[in-house]
């Protein structure tokens, strides 16, 4: 039940996160005109990944797309790429996770397949979230750099007679939406990965496989754990990473294809 809840919650959180990443990518307010310490203008500038806009005091807003591809800064192209990769991975992850949901029955799909799909979607969500966070952070870094550069030469004058105020840009709403959305997608992915462990059938967990020799039995535990002899009370060693209370001997009586690595 807890596994289903974790998986379901992971899916919902990731869904919200990806919706947020899509929204952030489409938003025009990645950078907005800095109003602090500036003359009061009757024009407000803001820019997105795809177009720049000007809102006039009259109430009119004019937006212009970036119709060039080669003329755009490499950083902007990189941010676009990161956000698109994030969206694509997230969308595929959502598609995979829908079929992986424990509450959805598709034919005679085995729990092991569902576990694998859950893990796959979880990894996809994590990468998607990281892409979004990276994209937004790169853009934010670009803004900070440009902000201080334009502050350094805030006023560029012609012979000291005429002052031209440079428009400085600061963080827009889309950056915060992107950070939060990326974080949610990342959290959702982690939850899916956690759910995967609980989803896997009992046999898929790391089990100690006992190889019975002629004189005595030795249980070899994978993963570098100390091998224990099969004499006396040691033959009742509890297996590692198992939610149940079965012993090695009990496992041996239910062989499956997963027992032999």
């Amino acid at each position: 039940m807890a596994v289903t809840a974790c998986q379901g919650l992971g899916f919902v959180v990731s869904l919200i996160g990806i919706a947020g990443i899509i929204a952030a990518t489409c938003m025009d307010q990645w950078s907005t005109q800095d109003l602090y310490n500036n003359p009061v203008t009757a024009v407000f500038n803001y820019q997105g990944l795809w177009r720049s806009c000007v809102r006039e005091s009259s109430g009119f807003t004019e937006c212009r797309g970036y119709f060039t591809l080669l003329g755009l800064p490499a950083m902007l192209q990189a941010v676009r790429a990161l956000m698109i990769v994030g969206i694509v991975l997230g969308a595929i992850g959502l598609l995979v996770s829908i079929f992986a949901l424990k509450c959805i029955r598709i034919g005679s799909m085995e729990d092991s397949a569902k576990a694998n799909m859950t893990l796959t979607s979880g990894i996809m969500f994590i990468v998607s979230g990281l892409c979004a966070i990276a994209g937004v952070s790169v853009f934010a870094n670009m803004l900070v750099t440009n902000f201080w550069m334009s502050t350094a030469n805030m006023y560029t004058g012609m012979g000291g007679m005429v002052q031209t105020v440079q428009t400085r840009y600061t963080f827009g709403a889309a950056l915060f939406v992107g950070w939060v959305a990326g974080g949610l997608t990342l959290i959702g992915g982690v939850m899916m990965c956690i759910a995967c462990r609980g989803l896997a059938p009992e046999e898929t967990n790391y089990k100690a496989v006992s190889y019975h020799a002629s004189g005595h039995s030795v249980a070899y535990k994978p993963g570098g754990f100390k091998a224990s002899t099969g004499f006396g009370s040691n033959t009742k060693n509890k297996k590692i990473y198992d939610g149940g209370a079965r012993t090695e001997d009990e496992v041996q009586s239910y062989p499956s294809k997963h027992d032999y690595v």
Epitope: Q33, P39, V40, T41, A42, V43, N45, Y46, Q47, S52, C53, V54, E56, S57, S58, G59, F60, E62, R64, V162, Q163, T164, V165, Q166, T167
Partner: antibody
Framework: DVQLVESGGGLVQPGGSRKLSCTAS????????MNWVRQAPEKGLEWVAF????????HYLDTVKGRFTISRDNPKNTLFLQMTSLRSEDTAMYYC???????????WGQGTSVIVSS | DIVMTQSPSSLTVTAGEKVTMSCKSS????????????LTWYQQKPGQPPKLLIY???TRESGVPDRFTGSGSGTYFTLTISSVQAADLAVYYC?????????FGSGTKLEIK
């Protein structure tokens, strides 16, 4: 057809008050920023105050700040200018204007005259 | 506040002549976001309210005759009337539409001989 009609002008004593109104028609009033512009006799144009379509942004000329209040009633398509502590230098023809593309004032009313005199 | 300086203060020309008047602003009116200059020209005929002629420094308002041309960028702007007509007798004002408070130039009075 866009129309702006000002009213409320007249003779006022120094220190007195007056409320000017501007009734708009022929356009979606709440979508446009509006201004009051004045012109003293035989003088040039002087912008007085601005109010955005949703009344969330307001700006005033420094010399009228604290004395004049611009407001609007969008359902009634009306713009107001409440003037208090009037001075002789406030004597002018007051025009109501609509702000359009490029922040240009594309429509002007015929104006209402305010005379501040004892 | 932005200071708008218009010159000359008055002009007397004969009908059919070409006339140019200038307007200087104390700060650039060019908006980097859309590369537009927020400067407007108005015409005020005697006893009438002003009329919009040109916005964005060079965009003619609909219904304005094409003999009126606006040009310039940054801090220096001009209004040119290619062939003055008797109907053009008026005072012409330039206005800063970029910074609050909006400021007008003192005007150029155009008189016909």
């Amino acid at each position: 057809d866009v129309q702006l009609v000002e009213s409320g002008g007249g003779l006022v004593q120094p220190g007195g008050s007056r409320k000017l109104s501007c009734t708009a028609s022929g356009f979606t009033f709440n979508s446009f920023g509006m201004n009051w512009v004045r012109q003293a006799p035989e003088k040039g144009l002087e912008w007085v105050a601005f109010i955005s379509g949703g009344s969330n942004t307001i700006h005033y000329l420094d010399t009228v700040k604290g004395r004049f209040t611009i407001s609007r009633d969008n359902p009634k398509n009306t713009l107001f200018l409440q003037m208090t502590s009037l001075r002789s230098e406030d004597t002018a023809m007051y025009y109501c204007t609509r702000l359009a593309l490029g922040n240009a004032m594309d429509y002007w009313g015929q104006g209402t005259s305010v005379i501040v005199s004892s | 506040d932005i200071v708008m300086t218009q010159s000359p203060s008055s002009l007397t020309v004969t009908a059919g002549e070409k006339v140019t008047m200038s307007c200087k602003s104390s700060q650039s009116l060019l908006n980097s976001g859309n590369q537009k200059n927020y400067l407007t020209w108005y015409q005020q005929k005697p006893g009438q309210p002003p009329k919009l002629l040109i916005y964005w420094a060079s965009t003619r308002e609909s219904g304005v005759p094409d003999r009126f041309t606006g040009s310039g960028s940054g801090t220096y702007f001009t209004l040119t009337i290619s062939s003055v007509q008797a109907a053009d007798l008026a005072v012409y004002y330039c206005q800063n539409d970029y910074y609050f408070p909006f400021t007008f130039g003192s005007g150029t009075k155009l008189e016909i001989k």
